[in-house]
């Protein structure tokens, strides 16, 4: 599989800043590793869309990691 | 209103350089990938090459590796392909898009970008 140049991170860029709340599957958080030195949050879409980076700066995406993080602690 | 603009296409040889400019308009330059795609006579659009725009990351398809080099002026909103060695299979209209949000394992897939520019023909005569 080729590589980027520049680590191991899943998502290309910074990400979109929102995704329908209605279009949203599920939400994943992929915390810095050795792999990837940032946060990384992957939406996968409804109805076999297939996969966004969600950009996690932004106000969607912090309100999801704190709603993953209130489930997971 | 977005707009991507390619240009540089042309006819020559086999062996021979191509650069091809893919001008965007209309959108933040750095929030979005430009990938350049392809697409021959009878076959499928297929992906040749990715740069991100806000870290310069680069993607190559295994049959363009070694020979084309893509790379951005983000002052000037243009990415631009360098295409050495040129071979008859190269032969295509290659379109320039732009994806936001994309994961690295669908970095070169059609289906994952939002807007397209119009193509520009390349020819490789033998």
């Known amino acids: 599989f080729p590589m980027f140049k520049r680590g191991r991170c899943l998502c290309i860029g910074p990400g979109v800043k929102a995704v329908k709340v209605a279009d949203i599957e599920k939400a994943s958080i992929m915390y810095p590793s050795n792999n990837c030195d940032k946060i990384e949050v992957i939406i996968t879409l409804k109805e076999n869309k297939g996969q966004r980076c969600l950009n996690p700066k932004s106000k969607q995406a912090r309100l999801i990691i704190k709603k993953v993080e209130r489930k997971n602690f | 209103e977005v707009q991507l603009v390619e240009s540089g296409g042309g006819l020559v040889q086999a062996g021979g350089s191509l650069r091809l400019s893919c001008a965007a308009s209309?959108?933040?330059?750095?929030?979005?990938?430009i990938g350049w795609f392809r697409q021959a006579p009878g076959k499928e659009r297929e992906g040749v090459s990715l740069?991100?725009?806000?870290?310069?990351?680069?993607y190559y398809a295994d049959s363009v590796k070694g020979r084309f080099t893509i790379s951005s002026d983000n002052a000037k909103n243009t990415v631009y392909l360098q295409m050495n060695s040129l071979k008859p299979e190269d032969t295509a209209v290659y379109y320039c898009?732009?994806?936001?949000?994309?994961?690295?394992?669908?970095?070169?897939?059609?289906?994952?970008?939002?807007?397209w520019g119009q193509g520009t023909q390349v020819t490789v005569s033998s």
């Open positions: 209309g959108f933040s330059f750095d929030d979005y990938a």
């Open positions: 898009a732009a994806g936001q949000g994309l994961l690295r394992a669908q970095a070169l897939r059609w289906e994952s970008y939002d807007y």
């Open positions: 740069i991100s725009s806000s870290d310069g990351s680069t």
